[in-house]
């Protein structure tokens, strides 16, 4: 049994880091493998993660952490029974993938303005809380070409757009994702999408 693709890990910079790797053949990850992880700290102890299958030869493990600070470094040991298959390390602050925003809501009752709001996925005491910026994706269910991205570079989790920038009388969907420049993170996953029917009063045509 050998590791074909070494584990790569990303952290949500809160409580979970996710490591993925591939074996050289079909593997029952949960019964055959264990990933041991330990914070490099005098008084820490090793924790065991039981991996799950992620495709035939792929494995994924969700490492639980109390919290994360920039100095944290973890040692990782991948075991198959008594055999050490791979040894490495992981610094969560250097591999951050933020949590996805939640509770995306489209408020259509403001006069001819669409207000999209969502929730910051971090509690106020987390460092990323004040460092997230967002991308909002809006697309038409009827027209695949009607697909747009709005970059929200301010901290407030909201976006206002004129309803008239979208076509009237058709349904749209929106979703939002986050990233943090400070840690050069990857983008989060997209939030679940939300759907609304876009309708607004056409202005009187002037002749």
């Amino acid at each position: 049994m050998k590791v074909l693709q070494e584990p790569t890990c990303v952290s949500d910079y809160m409580s979970i880091s996710t490591c993925e790797w591939k074996m050289n053949g079909p593997t029952n990850c949960s019964t055959e493998l264990r990933l041991l992880y330990q914070l490099v700290f005098l008084l820490s102890e090793a924790h065991t993660c039981i991996p799950e299958n992620n495709g035939g030869a792929g494995c994924v493990c969700h490492l639980l952490m109390d919290d994360v600070v920039s100095a944290d470094n973890y040692t990782l040991d991948l075991w198959a029974g008594q055999q050490l298959l791979w040894k490495g390390s992981f610094k969560p602050s250097e591999h951050v993938k933020p949590r996805a925003p939640g509770n995306l809501t489209v408020h259509t009752n403001v006069s001819d303005t669409l207000l999209l709001t969502w929730s910051n996925p971090y509690p106020p005491d987390n460092y990323l809380y004040n460092h997230l910026t967002y991308a909002v994706n809006i697309w038409s269910e009827n027209d695949p070409a009607d697909f747009r991205i709005y970059n929200v570079t301010y901290l407030e989790p909201s976006l206002r757009i004129a309803a008239s920038t979208l076509k009237s009388g058709i349904s749209y969907r929106a979703r939002v994702r986050a990233w943090a420049q400070c840690y050069n993170t990857t983008w989060s996953e997209w939030s679940p999408s939300t759907k609304w029917h876009n309708s607004y009063r056409e202005p009187f045509e002037q002749h």
Epitope: L42, L43, S44, E45, D66, A71
Partner: antibody, heavy 116, light 111 residues
Framework: EVQLLESGGGLVQPGGSLRLSCAAS????????MAWVRQAPGKGLEWVSA????????YYADSVKGRFTISRDNSKNTLYLQMNSLRAEDTAVYYC?????????WGQGTLVTVSS | QSVLTQPPSASGTPGQRVTISCSGS????????FNWYQQLPGTAPKLLIY???HRPSGVPDRFSGSKSGTSASLAISGLRSEDEADYYC???????????LGGGTKLTVLG
């Protein structure tokens, strides 16, 4: 609410023994390393000993090595410090502290006086 | 004598910014991060800063920490009378498997 309550302090003669206890509540005791820190009257803080969450690894300051023993009972949420061969210079307030990278919660301390 | 050196005293007037230094000796290992504790008169110490610059919840943002090599600093801005206390720096010494604490700095708020 995290609470640490030390007990067992008192007056003891040089060469004597004392056992301090620290009762923990308000958090999952078995998931945290713990430590003892002391403060002699009018002096600064001095780290004494620390123990990992399972008790697998234990560390002592040179000044108490061979005389003091730290231990824990996770089923009772209690930390202990067995102090033998006590000396006058061990006189101090002994604080129990929870460890999360640093000493993030402290008890109110118990006074140990070593005097003849 | 402590491996971490702090000035024995510091002072400032209300509203001022004061800084307390904590210096590791030249041979001190540059590995662990620094922590700061506040001890108000007659009370148990309290964690103020951990991992060089992180504040536990409930600690005002007037308190900030920084690290440079084997030295660290605690800054207190907008000084208040209730900040009058002893301040200690500490770090894990991985070379000797121990926790070391500075000698403490007594902060006096004047006026």
């Amino acid at each position: 609410e995290v609470q640490l309550l030390e007990s067992g302090g008192g007056l003891v003669q040089p060469g004597g023994s004392l056992r301090l206890s620290c009762a923990a509540s308000g958090f999952t005791f078995s998931r945290h390393a713990m430590a003892w820190v002391r403060q002699a009257p009018g002096k600064g803080l001095e780290w004494v000993s620390a123990i990992t969450m399972s008790g697998r690894s234990i560390y002592y300051a040179d000044s108490v090595k061979g005389r003091f023993t730290i231990s824990r009972d996770n089923s009772k949420n209690t930390l202990y410090l067995q102090m033998n061969s006590l000396r006058a210079e061990d006189t101090a307030v002994y604080y129990c502290a929870r460890v999360h990278r640093a000493f993030d919660y402290w008890g109110q301390g118990t006074l140990v006086t070593v005097s003849s | 004598q402590s491996v971490l050196t702090q000035p024995p005293s510091a002072s400032g007037t209300p509203g001022q910014r004061v800084t307390i230094s904590c210096s590791g000796s030249p041979l001190f290992p540059d590995s662990g991060s620094f922590n700061w504790y506040q001890q108000l008169p007659g009370t148990a110490p309290k964690l103020l800063i951990y991992a060089d610059s992180h504040r536990p919840s409930g600690v005002p943002d007037r308190f900030s920490g920084s690290k440079s090599g084997t030295s660290a600093s605690l800054a207190i801005s907008g000084l208040r009378s209730e900040d009058e206390a002893d301040y200690y720096c500490g770090t894990w010494d991985y070379s000797l498997n121990r926790y070391v604490l500075g000698g403490g700095t007594k902060l006096t708020v004047l006026g």
